[in-house]
Amino acid sequence: LRKVAHLTGKSNSRSMPLEWEDTYGIVLLSGVKYKKGGLVINETGLYFVYSKVYFRGQSCNNLPLSHKVYMRNSKYPQDLVMMEGKMMSYCTTGQMWARSSYLGAVFNLTSADHLYVNVSELSLVNFEESQTFFGLYKL
Amino acid sequence: LRKVAHLTGKSNSRSMPLEWEDTYGIVLLSGVKYKKGGLVINETGLYFVYSKVYFRGQSCNNLPLSHKVYMRNSKYPQDLVMMEGKMMSYCTTGQMWARSSYLGAVFNLTSADHLYVNVSELSLVNFEESQTFFGLYKL
Amino acid sequence: LRKVAHLTGKSNSRSMPLEWEDTYGIVLLSGVKYKKGGLVINETGLYFVYSKVYFRGQSCNNLPLSHKVYMRNSKYPQDLVMMEGKMMSYCTTGQMWARSSYLGAVFNLTSADHLYVNVSELSLVNFEESQTFFGLYKL
């Protein structure tokens, strides 16, 4: 069976890393486990990993935004940032604003790698399933 | 044969959903049909679906922009928005501006699903083949 | 073996096309050659090609930004732009700013095609491996 995941935004995320909807809606989870915000790899190989985050706010103050996909493995002492997007000076002060960040690339992942998504400012994330998501598939 | 499509912008289109060039240039269409703006799935399975839209204008007024990939199937009464990008407050008032929206993710699609792309303002889309496109491939 | 590449930003790039790190870090290069900034295809077929570029500056002057993935083949007299992103009027004058451009799509590539990435303003690119990259894989 194809190893694949597509998880969507979960609005009751209160901490980092982001948590994801893994059951309802347009979610996919096959041959990969989901655990506390992370996708857990159980077969070493090449994977295309992607994520989109939708940021928005009522009144722009140009707070710097970052969106990271990172990897954690008990064998390594430190998280590895695989992909990252940053935004600064992206809207007009005081205005209602909205912006997305998209990341996607190929990585060689190892069994027991845990993949997570982090953002700099949780309160500015909108968690609609079509707008904020995290996924991968094994090539 | 691999089921794959890569369609590019078609500039004389006035209708929603967007219409696409399916014949000339860097277009691909194999094992998938194109019909009135839509990619028609003829084999159930997992697909990576993507789209990019290039918005631009002569004089910025920060018109809210949206870019959606959605699915329609005669079995279901309503369109399903699979992926969406929104932009608000993205340029400096009065200036010439340009911005892209990119979407891409994995979905479980069913034979007879029709996939389309919608934008909030057609007048602000530039249809160059390298800038605005819509595609998918079966995993 | 799967034909795949993921190259990351190389900060000593001084000219176009961009040059890439092809050895250290989260780099992948298998069944594809890297030569003077280009990925060289050695087997005709369908490929998903992607790139992300992270632009940033100390003081915004809204210099138009472009990010292109293009193809060169000795059989053809001219480069073919496969994907392109442009940005104009994207930050507030005088402010520190940061923005990414992401491109990704499927193409039918031929043995001996050379793929490159070009940007309009090299001095505004940040080459962190998680932020600026270029890759592909054969479907």
């Epitope: - | 500039s11 007024n61 018109l63 809210p64 909030s120 057609l122 007048s123 | -």
Partner: antibody, heavy 119, light 111 residues
Framework: QVQLVQSGAEVKKPGSSVKVSCKAS????????ISWVRQAPGQGLEWMGW????????QYNENFKGRVTITADKSTSTAYMELSSLRSEDTAVYFC????????????WGQGTLVTVSS | EIVMTQSPATLSVSPGERATLSCRAS??????????IHWYQQKPGQPPRLLIY???HLESGIPARFSGSGSGTEFTLTISSLQSEDFAVYYC?????????FGQGTKVEIK
């Protein structure tokens, strides 16, 4: 900058036709609709129809019962509105306006052309 | 067709005061994304000028004292502090479907 320049005032007899022109500049003519809106003396605004110069498609307000025809010439970036079977109640100022396709708000207007229908 | 009804027909306001103009649609002009209502100002002998689009978005070059609100069938144009140049006729227009229709207008005059 965007400009829409209309042809001059016309005086017409009842039963005749009038053709008003609207020359666009400062933007890509084929990417926006051109709408026509009229305003009778001391009255409000009435939308007559639009044309999309990109492919020549058009839509009309049924209140005009086939009397209105809107055309466009891409080579000169000019739109035209022809109103036939004129009657006295067609006396009005006729405006062309650039319209965004999807949002359909009128963001730039011509200066207006007064058409007087009188015997 | 959708009928747009504006009220009041005439509004007498002193310079510096706030003006609130209403527009009601005979059926909803909103979708999940946007409310397809636009506001224009017209002065004698001039074409209309776009002020607010999609119910609440200020057109480029329009002073911030103009604002719009509402959804569904009820919409409001507010001028926070009337200036002498604001005395004019104001029209709402919908673009939810064909035909596009305008309200009959509200004349804002000096009190």
């Amino acid at each position: 900058q965007v400009q829409l320049v209309q042809s001059g005032a016309e005086v017409k007899k009842p039963g005749s036709s009038v053709k008003v022109s609207c020359k666009a500049s400062g933007y890509t003519f084929t990417r926006f609709d051109i709408s026509w809106v009229r305003q009778a003396p001391g009255q409000g605004l009435e939308w007559m129809g639009w044309i999309f110069p990109g492919d020549g498609s058009s839509q009309y307000n049924e209140n005009f019962k086939g009397r209105v025809t809107i055309t466009a010439d891409k080579s000169t970036s000019t739109a035209y509105m022809e109103l036939s079977s004129l009657r006295s109640e067609d006396t009005a100022v006729y405006f062309c306006a650039r319209s965004l396709i999807s949002t359909a708000m009128f963001d730039h207007w011509g200066q207006g052309t007064l058409v007087t229908v009188s015997s | 067709e959708i009928v747009m009804t504006q009220s009041p027909a005439t509004l007498s306001v002193s310079p510096g005061e706030r003006a609130t103009l209403s527009c009601r649609a005979s059926k909803s002009v909103s979708t999940s994304d946007f409310s397809y209502i636009h506001w224009y100002q017209q002065k004698p002998g001039q074409p209309p000028r776009l002020l607010i689009y999609l119910a609440s978005h200020l057109e480029s070059g329009i002073p911030a004292r103009f604002s719009g609100s509402g959804s569904g069938t009820e919409f409001t144009l507010t001028i926070s502090s009337l200036q002498s140049e604001d005395f004019a006729v104001y029209y709402c227009q919908h673009s939810r479907e064909l035909p596009r229709t305008f309200g009959q207008g509200t004349k804002v005059e000096i009190k």
